[in-house]
Interface confidence: low
C-alpha cells in the first residue's frame, strides 16, 4: 500500500486526513501540522517545510492542537466575582476556577464568569443535592418524613427526629418538618392537649 503522506502535503479538496492535528493552509493549498497543546506556531509552514512550533512562555498557554501564532495569557480567578483557584495555569491548560464555598455560578460564557451567594433554604427544607457543586442555586425541598431542619441556611441538612423510646423517654409532642420530637420522662404528667394550641 502507498505510504501515508506527511505534512506538508497537497490537498485539492481543502480537507486534511487528521482534522485534530493538521490544518489546511489555503495560500499554498497544502495540509500542515498543527502545534500540540502547550506550544504555538513560531514559523508557518510552506510547501517544503512543515510548521515549526515553540513552547509557550511562562504564564501563558494553549489548550488544544492549534495554529495560533501566540499563546493565551494565564488569568487568575477573580475573587471579586466569587471565583477561587482549584488548579494553577500550565502551558497546556488555563487556570481552573470554581465558585467559592456557599456560592453558585450565575453567569456562564463557556466557563463560569460570575458567582453569587447560594440562597438559604428555610426551616423545614434542605438543598437538593447536586451532581456538581457550584453549578446552580439551591433548590430547596421539604424534609422527608421523620426528619426536621430548624434553621435558614444554604447548607443545613434535614436530621432524623429523636426517637424518645431509644432514650427511655416517651413522646410529649411529635416532631414536625421544622422541629424535633419533644420527649418527656414517662413519670411526668401528660401536657395539656396540644390540638389548636401553639407549641413554643
Amino acid at each position: 500500500s502507498q505510504p501515508q503522506a506527511v505534512p506538508p502535503y497537497a490537498s485539492e479538496n481543502q480537507t486534511c486526513r487528521d482534522q485534530e492535528k493538521e490544518y489546511y493552509e489555503p495560500q499554498h493549498r497544502i495540509c500542515c501540522s498543527r502545534c500540540p497543546p502547550g506550544t504555538y506556531v513560531s514559523a508557518k509552514c510552506s510547501r517544503i517545510r512543515d510548521t515549526v512550533c515553540a513552547t509557550c512562555a511562562e504564564n501563558s498557554y494553549n489548550e488544544h492542537w492549534n495554529y495560533l501564532t501566540i499563546c493565551q495569557l494565564c488569568r487568575p480567578c477573580d475573587p471579586v466575582m466569587g471565583l477561587e483557584e482549584i488548579a494553577p495555569c500550565t502551558s497546556k491548560r488555563k487556570t481552573q476556577c470554581r465558585c467559592q464555598p456557599g456560592m453558585f455560578c450565575a453567569a456562564w460564557a463557556l466557563e463560569c464568569t460570575h458567582c453569587e451567594l447560594l440562597s438559604d433554604c428555610p426551616p423545614g427544607t434542605e438543598a437538593e443535592l447536586k451532581d456538581e457543586v457550584g453549578k446552580g442555586n439551591n433548590h430547596c425541598v421539604p424534609c422527608k418524613a421523620g426528619h426536621f431542619q430548624n434553621t435558614s441556611s444554604p447548607s443545613a441538612r434535614c436530621q432524623p427526629h429523636t426517637r424518645c423510646e431509644n432514650q427511655g423517654l416517651v413522646e410529649a409532642a411529635p416532631g414536625t418538618a421544622q422541629s424535633d420530637t419533644t420527649c418527656k420522662n414517662p413519670l411526668e404528667p401528660l401536657p395539656p392537649e396540644m390540638s389548636g394550641t401553639m407549641l413554643m
Epitope: P122, G124, T125, C140, A177, Q178
Partner: nanobody, 117 residues
Framework: EVQLVESGGGLVQPGGSLRLSCAAS?????????MAWYRQAPGKQRELVAV???????NYPDSVEGRFTISRDNAKNTVYLQMNSLRPEDTAVYYC??????????WGQGTLVTVSS
C-alpha cells in the same frame, strides 16, 4: 391568633377516596413556609403523612406515596389532602399543621377518617 380547621373526614370503604381541607384563619398560610398533614391512629404516635413548602413541592412517607397528594391554595388560605386507594390502616384522626419557626407549631383539632367495609 392562628386557627386551623380541618374538614372532609368521614367513613369510606377500602379503595375509596376522600379530600381533606385545612382552612387557616388569623394569618395567611403564605406566611408559613411549611404546611403538613399528620395522622394519629388509636394507641399510636402522631405521624407525618404529607408536607408541602411555599413553592408547592411536596414530600410523602413510603406508606402513602402515590396514593395521597397534598396541595395548597394560598389565595383561599387552605391546604388540601387528596387521599385515594384508602386502606383500613389509613384509619386515624388527621391533623393539619403549620410550622412557623421560631414562633412555634400550630395544630388543628383533627378530623376523623375511618376506612371500613
Amino acid at each position: 391568633e392562628v386557627q386551623l380547621v380541618e374538614s372532609g373526614g368521614g367513613l369510606v370503604q377500602p379503595g375509596g377516596s376522600l379530600r381533606l381541607s385545612c382552612a387557616a384563619s388569623g394569618s395567611s398560610i403564605f406566611s408559613f413556609e411549611i404546611m403538613a398533614w399528620y395522622r394519629q391512629a388509636p394507641g399510636k404516635q402522631r405521624e407525618l403523612v404529607a408536607v408541602i413548602n411555599k413553592g408547592g413541592e411536596a414530600n410523602y412517607p413510603d406508606s402513602v406515596e402515590g396514593r395521597f397528594t397534598i396541595s395548597r391554595d394560598n389565595a383561599k388560605n387552605t391546604v388540601y389532602l387528596q387521599m385515594n386507594s384508602l386502606r383500613p390502616e389509613d384509619t386515624a384522626v388527621y391533623y393539619c399543621n403549620a410550622d412557623a419557626v421560631p414562633h412555634g407549631s400550630y395544630w388543628g383539632q383533627g378530623t376523623l377518617v375511618t376506612v371500613s367495609s
